[in-house]
Interface confidence: low
Amino acid sequence: EDELQVIQPEKSVSVAAGESATLRCAMTSLIPVGPIMWFRGAGAGRELIYNQKEGHFPRVTTVSELTKRNNLDFSISISNITPADAGTYYCVKFRKGSPDDVEFKSGAGTELSVRAKPSAPVVSGPAVRATPEHTVSFTCESHGFSPRDITLKWFKNGNELSDFQTNVDPAGDSVSYSIHSTARVVLTRGDVHSQVICEIAHITLQGDPLRGTANLSEAIRVPPTLEVTQQPMRAENQANVTCQVSNFYPRGLQLTWLENGNVSRTETASTLIENKDGTYNWMSWLLVNTCAHRDDVVLTCQVEHDGQQAVSKSYALEISAHQKEHGSDITHEAALAPTAPL
């Protein structure tokens, strides 16, 4: 009679996390008499998964009735599979012995791989804002997936990015894996409304990739441009000077007026006008009593934006010799002439 063979027909089985895995095993003979056991791994450190003879194995059920006469099918089903269950499973036949059963023959093994979905990608941007034309980095992380093969793409407003670096860890075999990618994005003035997207494709997602997003509005700072102009006034002894603060982001802005270097008024921008590109405009004005000045007045509009170093624009309000002599007899001879910024 031919010697008993232990047949594990599948070299590998792949199941999704949470499902049941069926591991098939068949014997070619009823002889020798003795139990079968299932192990994960080989050698001294192998883990007992199922013992036909004794023990409690709540997640394991046998596919057929093992006590049935002439049964040669020793397949098992393991419920609620997790990535930690991955490994090679061996069906082992033991020969009845005294005092202990003796290992007789092992199957070739079935490798169980577990398909686990990646977690939703988390995209994070730079800790500090940067100005247009600078490069900022965004990171994308996802964890807990298996198998290791995974595809990650970056997009900015629907356009694919190519300046990125992706690593999948660990490098060797593991029950599950993590992916970490860093993309470099060059900011432009129009990026307040822009978005970066990290897209992950994996076999478990069945063609429906996971996406994580980040808004460039959190990463960009668009510094303002300043323009100081004089508005026409009916009163001869007054000059109305405005400071137009344009195209800045984010909102936080404080403006200070100085007359000849002395603080005249400080205000915080409140009612802003939003531009189509997401940046803001704001205007402040200063009423100057020209008759109070015997000499030229240097007016400075100083703006501190988003905690950055102040920028300013200065203009000289020229008082003519005639005005200087006649004090309050100030006419329209007052003129606004630009000076170099302070």
């Epitope: 093969d149 595809t151 793409k153 300046d163 670096q165 690593n167 490098a171 494709a201 063609g207």
Partner: antibody, heavy 117, light 107 residues
Framework: DVQLQESGPGLVKPSQSLSLTCTVT?????????WHWIRHFPGNILEWMGY???????NYNPSLKSRISITHDTSKNHFFLRLNSVTAEDTATYYC??????????WGQGTLVTVSA | DIVMTQSPATLSVTPGDRVSLSCRAS??????LHWYHQKSHESPRLLIK???QSISGIPSRFSAGGSGSDFTLTINSVEPEDVGVYYC?????????FGGGTKLEIK
């Protein structure tokens, strides 16, 4: 413009190690991307061998894992291939390349390595 | 490993012809398929990435499509400098693998 140039011995004896250098100009390898080695066998067979990332993490083709090592020297803007225990089957044109994602954007001109006694 | 199969092995065409090259993956690779062109004694050059995305500097006569496991590269009007070997590459799963190439010849 990014350019890559392979260099190393054109003849290696069986059982010895094959060592090649890729010199990169026009881009600092410490700034980003993956840096790959790919070989071209006679008969139009291209094989991806492995890469090293800008940060020094390497990843290899499982078929070569026991024999291959890819390292870099960011100060010189070089990265290296070492393939141990070569046989005649390792005779090929070896290319270094810069990866854009899972593709190869820039390639070196290639260097022919013959394994023969 | 994912096996990439290209057909035909050789293609002989006349300048001005419209030609299609086929690439098949042994399993679904979504759209993670890239095309290269290698002229004699030159390095491969990236033509198309992610199945259909054009690369700057590549003539517009090159286009491509497909997803899953079947992909096609089309040359709208072949020119003499298009001779060489065309390779497809799996960019979906490591190890990245290449097809065996399609050699384009001019009659």
């Amino acid at each position: 413009d990014v350019q890559l140039q392979e260099s190393g011995p054109g003849l290696v004896k069986p059982s010895q190690s094959l060592s090649l250098t890729c010199t990169v100009t026009g881009f600092s390898i410490s700034r980003g991307y993956d840096w790959h080695w790919i070989r071209h066998f006679p008969g139009n067979i291209l094989e991806w061998m492995g890469y090293i990332t800008y940060s020094g993490i390497s990843n290899y083709n499982p078929s070569l894992k026991s024999r291959i090592s890819i390292t870099h020297d960011t100060s010189k803007n070089h990265f290296f291939l070492r393939l141990n225990s070569v046989t005649a089957e390792d005779t090929a044109t070896y290319y270094c390349a810069r990866g854009g994602g899972a593709w190869f954007t820039y390639w070196g001109q290639g260097t022919l390595v013959t394994v023969s006694a | 490993d994912i096996v990439m199969t290209q057909s035909p092995a050789t293609l002989s065409v006349t300048p001005g012809d419209r030609v299609s090259l086929s690439c098949r993956a042994s399993q679904s690779i979504s759209d993670s398929l890239h095309w290269y062109h290698q002229k004699s004694h030159e390095s491969p050059r990236l033509l198309i990435k992610y199945a259909s995305q054009s690369i700057s500097g590549i003539p517009s006569r090159f286009s491509a499509g497909g997803s899953g496991s079947d992909f096609t590269l089309t040359i709208n009007s072949v020119e003499p400098e298009d001779v060489g070997v065309y390779y497809c590459q799996n960019g979906h799963s490591l190890p990245w693998t290449f097809g065996g190439g399609t050699k384009l010849e001019i009659k």
